[in-house]
């Protein structure tokens, strides 16, 4: 819990590097995102593909989708779930991350020293030992959050099943119901290709206590779907009289010394006339 | 033939609680959420939350959060809704009602006949 | 919230005189929804996503609107349909009803 209240955000006085005074272990061990570069890669034959279960929703279900003011959230039923990790960690909520119109790489993680527009955050929480996301959240083995990083490129269709209902999520605090939908969609290609760490919550308080896992390929949305991302949000109330837009919600890479990063895959891409290899 | 029926209605104390029940039958009863609609007497229509009952998740009006709870019995295809605190403005006929989705969004496609809950002294 | 005002709150009509109910809300939505109530009734869904008729629904009745304003229309009154309207959007939390309209005999 933090010391003095609960007032943080990506810019200004009480930006990231402020943000240990009130959670300190912003300031501590095990902090993500991180840049993944070769140098701390190590492939691992032990990490098999994960199954993801009870991720197709039904639309006939109505989902919360939020505006907390940091980014937006999506709620997910307790009965969708990761297999394949030491316990079952069962959904708790998605949400996103993104830059600016003017400079559109707003992803938390990079890849050797890039950024990507935008990233994707499915979080989970180990339902074998904790009751519920909050109970979890500070403890070991507490969440596996699945990352995917997201670039410029086509139309994606199933993101639109969430840009969709942006409008009616403009302001901090206002929630807005979502069909469901398949959940999996929202994943890149081979997932069975990722890096895995140990690591933190990307915001206050920061928790170290997130299993990482890092799809290694993007997938791809217009630049229309990016630009609505980065202008249909913002981060204070409706009322509020100094509107603050929603943009640049992510978190600097964090010092990553001495640990490794471990990959589902031992090859490197080549690109070759027939496509990737 | 779909159909959902309410129960547990009749004169509370107030400050006392109440526990509805909502009986479904004829569908099944995981592919759709229940809701919890009230309407007091010659008054419009007030929504207080719904249940998933594939896992019990719940959603709440934040007017009835902390004072309403709502469960479900899948054995027996039953939806609960708790209410705590009662008050005079709590009386009101208690609906359940089921949302199905048509391409878009959902829409109320059958509803319970309602429990009148009265609270007085 | 989105606040959902109707209008008129009760009106008296003849039978085959049009009829039109408004409902304004606080804010847009994507789609209006009707149900209608008859005395010691649960309510029924009338209209759908704006414009379609739930099943059974007499084709007298159409529904149209966008963005805040939104109208149920009865072309022609018969006495099936004196009863009260309500409104309702679920493109935001909490989901609203408007207050209703009651449509009396005259």
């Known amino acids: 819990a933090p010391v003095n209240g609960s007032k943080w955000t990506y810019f200004g006085p009480d930006g990231e590097n402020s943000w240990s005074k009130k959670y300190p272990s912003c300031g501590g061990l095990l902090q993500s995102p991180i840049d993944l570069h070769s140098d701390i890669l190590q492939y691992d034959a032990s990490l098999t593909p994960l199954e993801f279960q009870g991720y197709n929703l039904s639309a006939n279900k109505q989902f919360l989708l939020t505006n907390n003011g940091h980014s937006v959230k999506l709620n997910l039923p307790s009965d969708m779930h990761i297999q394949g990790l030491q316990s079952r960690y069962s959904a708790t909520q998605l949400h996103l991350h993104w830059g600016n119109p003017n400079d559109p790489h707003g992803s938390e993680h990079t890849v050797s020293g890039q950024h990507f527009a935008a990233e994707l955050h499915i979080v989970h929480y180990n339902s074998d030992l904790y009751p519920d996301a909050s109970t979890a959240s500070n403890k070991s083995e507490g969440l596996a959050v699945l990352a995917v990083l997201i670039e410029m490129g086509s139309f994606n269709p199933s993101y639109d099943k969430i840009f969709s209902h942006l409008q009616h999520v403009k302001y901090k605090g206002q929630e807005a119901f979502v069909p469901g939908f398949n959940i999996e969609e929202l994943l890149p290609e081979r997932t069975a290709e990722y890096y895995r760490y140990r690591g933190s919550l990307t915001t206050p308080p920061c928790n170290p206590t997130v299993l990482w896992t890092v799809f290694r390929n993007p997938v791809q949305i217009s630049q229309e779907q990016l630009l609505a991302l980065e202008t249909a949000l913002y981060c204070t109330h409706m009322d509020d009289p100094s509107p603050r837009e929603m943009i640049n919600n992510f978190r600097q890479v964090q010092k990553f010394d001495e640990r490794l990063v471990y990959t589902s895959f031992s090859q490197v891409q080549v690109c070759t006339a027939a496509g990737l290899s | 033939e779909v159909q959902l029926v309410e129960s547990g209605g009749g004169l509370v104390q107030p400050g006392g609680s109440l526990r509805l029940s909502c009986a479904a039958s004829g569908y099944s009863y995981t592919d759709y959420n229940i809701y919890w609609v009230r309407q007091a007497p010659g008054k419009g229509l007030e929504w207080v939350g719904y249940?998933?009952?594939?896992?019990?998740?719940?959603t709440y009006n934040q007017k009835f959060k902390g004072r309403a709870t709502i469960s479900v019995d899948k054995s027996k295809n039953t939806a609960y809704l708790q209410m705590n605190s009662l008050r005079a403005e709590d009386t009101a006929v208690y609906y359940c009602s089921r949302p199905i989705y048509y391409g878009a969004y959902w829409y109320f496609d059958v509803w319970g006949q309602g429990t009148l809950v009265t609270v007085s002294s | 919230d989105i606040q959902m005002t109707q209008s008129p709150s009760s009106l008296s009509a003849s039978v085959g005189d049009r009829v039109t109910i408004t409902c304004r809300a606080s804010s847009p939505v994507t789609y209006m929804h009707w149900y209608q109530q008859k005395p010691g009734k649960a309510p029924r869904p009338w209209i759908y996503?704006?414009?379609s008729l739930a099943s059974g629904v007499p084709s007298r009745f159409s529904g149209s609107g966008s963005g805040t304003d939104f109208t149920l229309t009865i072309s022609s009154l018969q006495p099936e349909d004196f009863a009260t309207y309500y409104c309702q959007q679920w493109s935001s939390n909490p989901l609203t009803f408007g207050q209703g309209t009651k449509v009396e005999i005259k």
């Open positions: 996503a704006t414009s």
């Open positions: 249940i998933d009952p594939a896992n019990g998740d719940t």
